[in-house]
């Protein structure tokens, strides 16, 4: 167990052309806060996987605005580190994702407005217990400074925070088999805490919490025996009778070597050969250099020049993940309003607008029926950004220039019969019915203002009394 | 759904005059055909005057030419200005609203209008 520890030394406008604006502004005072999310390994995964090795937040910074003509100079940070406590082993090998966020403080209803002014990621090795590492990364115009550490919290040591250490019982040594715990001489390395209950005699750990069986041996606490039978396909000879062992789980079993990596037995555990490019205990650290061209979809390899210092890809726009493999889904946002239709172009975004909206995002309401006739005598309706006609007898269609049935929608209500006429649509109203679509009953049934249930309701025609 | 608010009922001698309003939320009143109609004391609803989603107006031979049937589309109400009152004429009159794109008729709560010396 432990904290990996970030501290922010300075976020603002990198050098060279293309100042960013100041984020904040008299109008619009903000502040800055940061998010880090860390994942074991060299993870592939887009930014948005989960933070598997821990998350943290920071404390909002001093709220900031600009001063009117003056460049956007470092804005005011946090105070404090940002602290994300680790359970289990340090991987040693990481990645990481920096997001500045900016709160705006002006007139907003419902509270304070977020937004994302700039991410970065990368991939590390670190070994815990080390001094600090500085970093300069870059997102867009703007430049993050920041140093990171792993430590272990005691009692845990080493540079994956697996070994323990305890308080040296005799003052002039450590109990057999046991070095002292450098850099604390003072302290003894502690045998590792196997699974509570695992066999001493027949289990055995390689990290704390785990129990694994000797051969010979199975169940959780490596206390079972493995039965015997007479075996087709023995893995040894028993000592216990003339029959053979059943085989157990093997530390090969499953296969623990990632990346194609082929696993052979030892004694006491498994040994991982790994491919080209891979190494680790279960092959899972990539040696990957810019050499191998690791980023795709155009983006720019930086770093890694030997296999132990990680490369970063700095991905063009529209694609994410540490190889720039993922195409980001900018339309999942919906940047596009009043019902526009957003196409993702890889290189920008565009937003087709509905009829009656206009600009790069459809924020703009037309007049809807402005420049826009209807034919054949139909009259323009304006409504929901989108104009409709409204078409004269005998005519539909979106600008009323298609000829219609006049009878085809039933606009005889109430079972009047329609009759299709040159000059338009009859409707022969049902006995009690008048108006120039049967829309009106002379007479509607029941005495009463609200009567208990609708009078002569007919299928399509029912009635509501409010 | 269409909700139906009528207003502008009272008392009023004979030969006066009354605007009834009714004011309609839910839906626009130019894709509605709307009407006035009438109850009078154990007497069946009959209908006054009604105007089409078209703008075409219809009204029953006692009123014609006394009652007036118009709409606003801005303010999204439907108004019936009666002139000439006669003692006959009161009674609670409601409004109505047949909704095309669903068939379906909505009635307001009535307001009453009593012709009386």
């Known amino acids: 167990a432990g904290v990996f520890e970030l501290q922010i030394h300075s976020f603002g406008p990198g050098p060279g052309p293309g100042a960013p604006r100041s984020p904040c502004s008299a109008r619009l005072p903000c502040r800055l806060f940061f998010r880090v999310c860390l994942k074991p390994g060299l993870s592939e995964e887009a930014a948005e996987s989960p933070c598997a090795l821990g998350a943290a937040l920071s404390a909002r910074g001093p709220v900031y605005t600009e001063q009117p003509g003056a460049p956007a100079p470092d804005l005011p940070l946090p105070d404090g580190l940002l602290q994300v406590p680790f359970r289990d082993a340090w991987p040693g090998t990481f990645s990481f994702i920096i997001e500045t966020w900016r709160e705006e403080l002006g007139d907003q209803i419902g509270g304070p407005a977020w937004s994302l002014l700039a991410r970065v990621a990368g991939r590390r090795r670190l070994a815990a217990g080390g001094p600090w590492a500085r970093d300069i990364q870059r997102a867009g115009a703007w430049e993050l400074r920041f140093s990171y550490r792993a430590r272990c919290e005691p009692p845990a040591v080493g540079t994956a925070c697996t070994r323990l250490c305890r308080p040296r019982s005799a003052p002039s040594r450590c109990g057999p088999g046991l070095r002292p715990c450098a850099p604390l001489e003072d302290e003894c390395e502690a045998p590792l805490v196997c699974r509570a209950g695992c066999s001493p005699e027949h289990g055995f750990c390689e990290q704390p919490g785990e129990c694994r069986c000797l051969e010979g041996w199975t169940g959780p606490l490596c206390t079972v025996p493995v039965s015997t039978s007479s075996c087709l396909s023995p893995r040894g000879p028993s000592s216990a009778t003339t029959g053979c062992l059943v085989p157990g789980p093997g530390p090969c079993d499953g296969n623990p070597c990632a990346n194609g990596g082929s696993c052979s037995e030892t004694p006491r555990s498994f040994e991982c050969t790994c491919p080209r490019g891979f190494y680790g205990l279960r092959c899972e650290v990539s040696g990957v250099t810019c050499a191998d061209g690791p980023c795709f979809n155009g983006g720019l390899c930086v770093g890694g020049a030997d296999p132990d210092s990680a490369y970063i890809c700095h991905c063009p726009p529209g694609f994410q993940g540490s190889n720039c493999e993922k195409r980001v889904d900018r339309c999942s946002l919906q940047p596009c309003r009043n019902g526009g239709l957003c196409l993702d172009l890889g290189h920008a975004l565009r937003c087709r607008c509905r009829a009656g909206f206009a600009g790069p995002r459809c924020e703009h309401d037309l007049d809807d029926c402005a420049g826009r006739a209807c034919a054949n005598g139909g009259t323009c309706v304006e409504g929901g950004g989108a104009h409709r006609c409204s078409c004269a007898l005998g005519f539909g269609g979106r600008d009323c220039r298609e000829r219609a049935d006049p009878c085809a929608a039933r606009p005889c209500a109430h079972g009047g019969r329609c009759y299709a006429h040159f000059s338009g649509l009859v409707c022969a109203c049902a006995p009690g019915y008048m108006g120039a679509r049967c829309e009106f009953p002379v007479h509607p049934d029941g005495a009463s203002a609200l009567p208990a249930a609708p009078p002569g309701l007919r299928p399509g025609d029912p009635q509501r009394y409010l | 759904e269409v909700q139906l608010v009528e207003s502008g009922g009272g008392l009023v001698q004979p030969g006066g005059s009354l605007t009834l309003s009714c004011a309609a939320s839910?839906?626009?009143?130019?894709?509605?055909?709307m009407a006035w109609y009438r109850q009078a004391p154990g007497k069946k609803r009959e209908l006054v005057a009604g105007i089409s989603a078209d703008g075409s107006t219809d009204y029953i031979l006692s009123v014609k030419g006394r009652f007036t049937i118009s709409r606003d589309n801005a303010k999204n109400s439907v108004y019936l200005q009666m002139n000439s009152l006669r003692a006959e004429d009161t009674a609670v009159y409601y409004c109505?609203?047949?909704?095309?794109?669903?068939?379906?008729?909505?009635w307001g709560q009535g307001t009453l209008v009593t012709v009386s010396s």
């Open positions: 839910g839906s626009s009143v130019k894709f509605l055909s």
């Open positions: 109505y609203a047949y909704e095309w794109t669903t068939r379906y008729t909505y």
